[in-house]
Interface confidence: low
C-alpha cells in the first residue's frame, strides 16, 4: 500500500460498498500523487478501533461514546477530523446535553432525588448516559443494576427501551416504555413532551430540542436549564449551563504515526468534490443503501481538529467523568474533612521543589502535579489531572477560553483589608538602559527585545498588541533583530538571545534563565535593548535586592522607561509612563473545584502567607528568591474576586479586546484547541 493511502475501516457490507465507491470516485478526481483510499472491513466499531491501533487500518468515524473507547489504553487513538452540521459560516461540531425544567419548579441540580424524570431512551447519550453518569455517585447503593438504582433515585421516570417488567418505576410516566415513536415520550421531542405535559419534573435532552419544539420565545421562557453549579439559566444560555458538551461524529486515528495530515488532506478534498450539493454521482453525506454509512447523512462538511487536542480535551471533563463513572462504576470515597486535597500544577523542576515543600507543610491539603509549560498545566486542570495554579493575565485569558474560572487574585500592595480588596492591576512597562539615550517607543525596529514569555501580559500581550496596531502584521521576529521571548519557535530570531542550554533554550519555564520578569530584565542587563516587564521588576532586582551575581551591583538609576508618547522617564514614574494597566495574576481552577480551591487557599495563606516573618526557617508561600515560583514573590495576599468571577469580568473588556486582536498572531495550540470547542 503506498504511503499516501488512508485505509478506511468499514463495519458492514453496506459501508464497505460505499467505501469502495468513495475510493473509486476519489481516484477519478485526485492526481496520482495525492491521497487515496483503501477499504478495510471489520465486524464492529470496536474491531475497527483495534485495527487502527494495530496499524491494520488508519481511520474510522465514531460517535462520542466510542471516541472515549478509542482513547482508552491500549488503543490510544485521537480525534483528527470532526463532522459539522448547520452552515459553513456557523458550523456545529458539538451538541450540549442539558437538563430542562419548568421555570416555577424551584429545585436545583443537587435536589433531583425524588423528582420525576424524562429520558430520551435507555443508554442514549444526552438522555441517559450523561445525566446518569454525572449523578452516578449520588445514586443509592447498590448501584448495580443501574436501572434499579435510578428507579430508586427518582420517584418515577419515563426511560423508553427500559425493561418495564423488572423496573416498572422507569416506565411509570410512559406505560410500557416503548422503544419507538409509538411511545409519545420517546426520543428528544418525546422526553420534552413528557416535561411539557407535566408528567415529569426534568427532561434530559439536547440543547436544540427546546428550540425545535417551541418556536415561540414566550413559550420557551417558561422553561429553564439546570446548571452543574446548582443554579439555573435561561434555555438560550446552554453554552454556559449544560451537563456536557458532546462531539457529534468524529474521525479518529493513531496518536503516533496516525497520518492525521493525510486524513485531513483526503477528507478536505473529498468534501470539495463530493460534499453537500457537489456531485450527483457520488455523495459523501448520503447513504442510498442504508443510514449514516461512513459519515452521518446530516453532516455538512469536515473541520480539522486542532493537533493539540487529545480525546480527553475533545470530549470534555464533564462527558469523560460521566462515561467513566458509568463504565468503571466506582465512586471516590470522599475524605472525612470537607474538601479533597487541591492538586497544584507546578512548572518544571524549581516550582516542583517549592510545591513539594508546600505539600509537606500543608499536611495533605495540597498535592503537586508537574508539567513543562503553562499550557500543559492548563490542559491538566481542564481534564482533572490537576486542580489549580496561579496565572499571568494572558494565560487567565487562555484558561478562561478553555472553561476554567478565576478564584482568587494576587494582591501586591499592603493594605488593612488585603483579602477583601482585589487590586486594579499592575503596570506593564518597557525598560531600557539609560545609556541608550536615543531609544524611544517609536524607533524599536531592529532592536533586541526581552520578553517574559509569549502569551504573558506585560511581556507579550500588551507590548505586542500595541505593536500590532502599529505594524498590522504578526512578524514580530522580523520587527526586532533578535530577542528572547520564551515559548517562541526554537528557530525564531526571538529565541536567539535566550540563554537556556540545549533543549531548555527558549522554553517558557525557569529552566530558561531569561524566562519571567526577572529573566527578561536579566536579558536586558546582559544582551538586550528593551525589556517588557512589570513596574516592580527594576526596583526588585536593583540596589542589592537580588543577590544573584548578575544583579547584585545594579542601580535603578541606570534604567529608564519608554513612554508611548515617544518620551522617556525615570523608573519610579511608571504611573505616568507605562504601556497599559495589566490585570494581576490570578488563581484558576475548574468550576466544580471553585469552592474547595477558594477555601483551602485562604486557609493556606493564613498559615504560610505574608504574616510569616521568618522565611529562612519557615515555609513561605509567596517567596522564592525573586524567581516568582508558584506565585509572584511580591504577592501580599490572595484576594476574593467578589463579582469578577469569570475571565472576561476579571481581565476587563479592554484587555480581553487587546488579547482578542492578538489572537490573529497566536501561536497557542491550546487556545486553538479550546476555541474549537467554544468558538
Amino acid at each position: 500500500v503506498p504511503d499516501k493511502t488512508v485505509r478506511w475501516c468499514a463495519v458492514s457490507e453496506h459501508e464497505a460498498t460505499k467505501c469502495q465507491s468513495f475510493r473509486d470516485h476519489m481516484k477519478s478526481v485526485i492526481p496520482s500523487d495525492g491521497p487515496s483510499v483503501a477499504c478495510v472491513k471489520k465486524a464492529s466499531y470496536l474491531d475497527c478501533i483495534r485495527a487502527i491501533a494495530a496499524n491494520e487500518a488508519d481511520a474510522v468515524t465514531l460517535d462520542a461514546g466510542l471516541v472515549y473507547d478509542a482513547y482508552l489504553a491500549p488503543n490510544n487513538l485521537k480525534p483528527v477530523v470532526a463532522e459539522f452540521y448547520g452552515s459553513k459560516e456557523d458550523p456545529q461540531t458539538f451538541y450540549y446535553a442539558v437538563a430542562v425544567v419548568k421555570k416555577d419548579s424551584g429545585f436545583q441540580m443537587n435536589q433531583l432525588r425524588g423528582k420525576k424524570s424524562c429520558h430520551t431512551g435507555l443508554g442514549r447519550s444526552a438522555g441517559w448516559n450523561i445525566p446518569i453518569g454525572l449523578l452516578y455517585c449520588d445514586l443509592p447503593e447498590p448501584r448495580k443494576p443501574l436501572e434499579k438504582a435510578v428507579a430508586n433515585f427518582f420517584s418515577g421516570s419515563c426511560a423508553p427501551c427500559a425493561d418495564g417488567t423488572d423496573f416498572p418505576q422507569l416506565c411509570q410516566l410512559c406505560p410500557g416504555c416503548g422503544c419507538s415513536t409509538l411511545n409519545q415520550y420517546f426520543g428528544y421531542s418525546g422526553a420534552f413532551k413528557c416535561l411539557k405535559d407535566g408528567a415529569g419534573d426534568v427532561a434530559f435532552v439536547k440543547h436544540s430540542t427546546i428550540f425545535e419544539n417551541l418556536a415561540n420565545k414566550a413559550d420557551r421562557d417558561q422553561y429553564e436549564l439546570l446548571c452543574l453549579d446548582n443554579t439555573r439559566k435561561p434555555v438560550d444560555e446552554y453554552k454556559d449551563c449544560h451537563l456536557a458538551q458532546v462531539p457529534s461524529h468524529t474521525v479518529v486515528a493513531r496518536s503516533m504515526g496516525g497520518k492525521e495530515d493525510l486524513i485531513w488532506e483526503l477528507l478536505n478534498q473529498a468534501q470539495e468534490h463530493f460534499g453537500k450539493d457537489k456531485s450527483k454521482e457520488f455523495q459523501l453525506f448520503s447513504s442510498p443503501h442504508g443510514k449514516d454509512l461512513l459519515f452521518k447523512d446530516s453532516a455538512h462538511g469536515f473541520l480539522k481538529v486542532p493537533p493539540r487536542m487529545d480525546a480527553k480535551m475533545y470530549l470534555g471533563y464533564e462527558y469523560v467523568t460521566a462515561i467513566r463513572n458509568l463504565r468503571e462504576g466506582t465512586c471516590p470515597e470522599a475524605p472525612t474533612d470537607e474538601c479533597k486535597p487541591v492538586k497544584w500544577c507546578a512548572l518544571s523542576h524549581h516550582e516542583r521543589l517549592k510545591c513539594d515543600e508546600w505539600s509537606v507543610n500543608s499536611v495533605g491539603k495540597i498535592e503537586c502535579v508537574s508539567a513543562e509549560t503553562t499550557e500543559d498545566c492548563i490542559a491538566k486542570i481542564m481534564n482533572g489531572e490537576a486542580d489549580a495554579m496561579s496565572l499571568d493575565g494572558g494565560f487567565v485569558y487562555i484558561a478562561g477560553k478553555c472553561g476554567l474560572v478565576p478564584v482568587l487574585a494576587e494582591n501586591y500592595n499592603k493594605s488593612d483589608n488585603c483579602e477583601d480588596t482585589p487590586e486594579a492591576g499592575y503596570f506593564a512597562i518597557a525598560v531600557v538602559k539609560k545609556s541608550a539615550s536615543d531609544l524611544t517607543w517609536d524607533n524599536l525596529k531592529g532592536k533586541k527585545s526581552c520578553h517574559t514569555a509569549v502569551g504573558r501580559t506585560a511581556g507579550w500581550n500588551i507590548p505586542m498588541g500595541l505593536l500590532y496596531n502599529k505594524i498590522n502584521h504578526c512578524r514580530f521576529d522580523e520587527f526586532f533583530s533578535e530577542g528572547c521571548a520564551p515559548g517562541s519557535k526554537k528557530d525564531s530570531s526571538l529565541c536567539k538571545l535566550c540563554m537556556g542550554s540545549g533543549l531548555n533554550l527558549c522554553e517558557p519555564n525557569n529552566k530558561e534563565g531569561y524566562y519571567g520578569y526577572t529573566g527578561a530584565f536579566r536579558c536586558l542587563v546582559e544582551k538586550g535593548d528593551v525589556a517588557f516587564v512589570k513596574h516592580q521588576t527594576v526596583p526588585q532586582n536593583t540596589g542589592g535586592k537580588n543577590p544573584d551575581p548578575w544583579a547584585k551591583n545594579l542601580n535603578e538609576k541606570d534604567y529608564e522607561l519608554l513612554c508611548l508618547d515617544g518620551t522617556r522617564k525615570p523608573v519610579e514614574e511608571y504611573a505616568n509612563c507605562h504601556l497599559a494597566r495589566a490585570p494581576n495574576h490570578a488563581v484558576v481552577t475548574r468550576k466544580d473545584k471553585e469552592a474547595c480551591v477558594h477555601k483551602i487557599l485562604r486557609q493556606q495563606q493564613h498559615l504560610f502567607g505574608s504574616n510569616v516573618t521568618d522565611c529562612s526557617g519557615n515555609f513561605c508561600l509567596f517567596r522564592s528568591e525573586t524567581k516568582d515560583l508558584l506565585f509572584r514573590d511580591d504577592t501580599v495576599c490572595l484576594a476574593k474576586l467578589h463579582d469578577r468571577n469569570t475571565y472576561e469580568k476579571y481581565l476587563g473588556e479592554e484587555y480581553v479586546k487587546a488579547v482578542g486582536n492578538l489572537r490573529k498572531c497566536s501561536t497557542s495550540s491550546l487556545l486553538e484547541a479550546c476555541t474549537f470547542r467554544r468558538p
Epitope: 432525588r113 452543574l228 463513572n325 470515597e333 475524605p335 470537607e338 479533597k340
Partner: nanobody, 121 residues
Framework: QVKLEESGGGLVQAGGSLRLSCVAS????????VGWYRQAPGKQRELVAA????????NYADSVKGRFTISRDIAKNTVYLQMDSLKPEDTAVYYC??????????????WGQGTQVTVSS
C-alpha cells in the same frame, strides 16, 4: 436534603462521660461520611471525629484520641459520639455533620443545629 438533629449535650464534671446522638432524616443514601465537629467560644470550628458510612475509615482529632469513640447504627440512621474522661477544654458546641457523596456536582455538607457540652472542673 438531609436533616440532622443532635441530642445528649449537657453539663458534666471533669472526668465524667456523655453520649451525643445525631439522627439523620431525608436523603440518607447520598451520604458517605458522618461525624462531629465542635466550636469553642472565639475559636474555629474543628473536627472531633468522623467516619465513612461504609465504616472503612475513621478519623479522630489528636486531642480526643483514646477518650472519644464514634459509632453508628445504620438501621436507625444515627451516629453517636461517646465522650469519656471529659476535660474542661472539651467545653464547646458540638455539631453533627454529614458529607454528601462527591460526584462532579458541587456539594455542601449538611449540619445540625449543635448541642452544648460544658465540662466543669
Amino acid at each position: 436534603q438531609v436533616k440532622l438533629e443532635e441530642s445528649g449535650g449537657g453539663l458534666v464534671q471533669a472526668g465524667g462521660s456523655l453520649r451525643l446522638s445525631c439522627v439523620a432524616s431525608g436523603n440518607v443514601f447520598g451520604i458517605d461520611a458522618v461525624g462531629w465537629y465542635r466550636q469553642a467560644p472565639g475559636k474555629q470550628r474543628e473536627l472531633v471525629a468522623a467516619t465513612t458510612t461504609s465504616g472503612s475509615s475513621t478519623n479522630y482529632a489528636d486531642s480526643v484520641k483514646g477518650r472519644f469513640t464514634i459509632s453508628r447504627d445504620i438501621a436507625k440512621n444515627t451516629v453517636y459520639l461517646q465522650m469519656d474522661s471529659l476535660k474542661p477544654e472539651d467545653t464547646a458546641v458540638y455539631y453533627c455533620y454529614a458529607r454528601p457523596k462527591q460526584a462532579t456536582l458541587i456539594r455542601d455538607d449538611y449540619w445540625g443545629q449543635g448541642t452544648q457540652v460544658t465540662v466543669s472542673s
